[in-house]
Interface confidence: medium
Amino acid sequence: RTVPPMVNVTCSEVSEGNITVTCRASSFYPRNITLTWRQDGVSLSHNTQQWGDVLPDGNGTYQTWVATRIRQGEEQRFTCYMEHSGNHGTHPVSGKVLVLQSHW
């Protein structure tokens, strides 16, 4: 069976004009998934991103996340790329800043 992920992008305020953008994928199966941030269509280097592991969400499906830190005002240049079971999509940063606990 294949259950496509639900993808959600959020922003959190951090200091000095930077924000942390987090892309969360949830409720997907099977477990193998691509999730990465892209700037102007190009994947960011590995060491500028932080990933959570792919973990069960309690419903027989899985969840994970990827986060990166960007300059506030440049949100429109960044997209979260998702690939799962042959399907793929890009998800933009909304620009709406939420006050969330950072992963960093």
Epitope: N32, T34, H46, Q50, D53, L55
Partner: antibody, heavy 119, light 108 residues
Framework: QVQLKQSGPGLVQPSQSLSITCIVS????????VHWVRQSPGKGLEWLGM???????DYNAAFISRLSINKDNSKSQVFLKMNSLQADDTGIYYC?????????????WGQGTSVTVSS | QILLTQSPAILSASLGERVTMTCTAS???????LHWYQQKPGSSPKLWIY???NLASGVPARFSGGGSGTSYSLTVSNMEAEDAATYYC?????????FGSGTKLEIK
Amino acid sequence: QVQLKQSGPGLVQPSQSLSITCIVSGFSLTTYGVHWVRQSPGKGLEWLGMIWTDGTTDYNAAFISRLSINKDNSKSQVFLKMNSLQADDTGIYYCVRKGHGYYYAMDYWGQGTSVTVSS
Amino acid sequence: QILLTQSPAILSASLGERVTMTCTASSSVSSSYLHWYQQKPGSSPKLWIYSTSNLASGVPARFSGGGSGTSYSLTVSNMEAEDAATYYCHQYHRSPFTFGSGTKLEIK
């Protein structure tokens, strides 16, 4: 720095079981999964299975009936046990860290445990 | 399972030469999940190129990778002595995850 150090027997009798311990340092088993891969002259590199951070396991169907992978997060140890070994199980067994990120490549390898199945 | 066929099995090259080895998959593999490893005799494999074209840390820029679908390649633009090794392609696209049989790159 990231290290995976393996210990285990070099010689196993046919039909007996193999146990290898992989002790990791420089990272936590609560944040990285670990694969087991073996290498033999006849079959090359073969993926055996892996254990995720939450302790769940994925196995190569060819080995699922005689392979188990476990871990002890507090001791930073991962364990491989394979039953009913035969001569064609001879090879080098590696524990390997599952890289994070969009590629999930095997980014750090242990030094390998050379296993000979022979009477 | 996905079979990865590497060719040639042995590749002899002169120092300074440009060389390319290929990896052909029996069914389509996402470029995100196609990786290359380098192994020298007596040592463990090392991650060399990940996701088709990204060089792992410390890998010289003379290495490059490319491809999509069922056809992938690794190229050395300017062969050096330290590049002599066996290179394996690997797919993490579908379980069981598989490796190619390797291309041994040697100095002519």
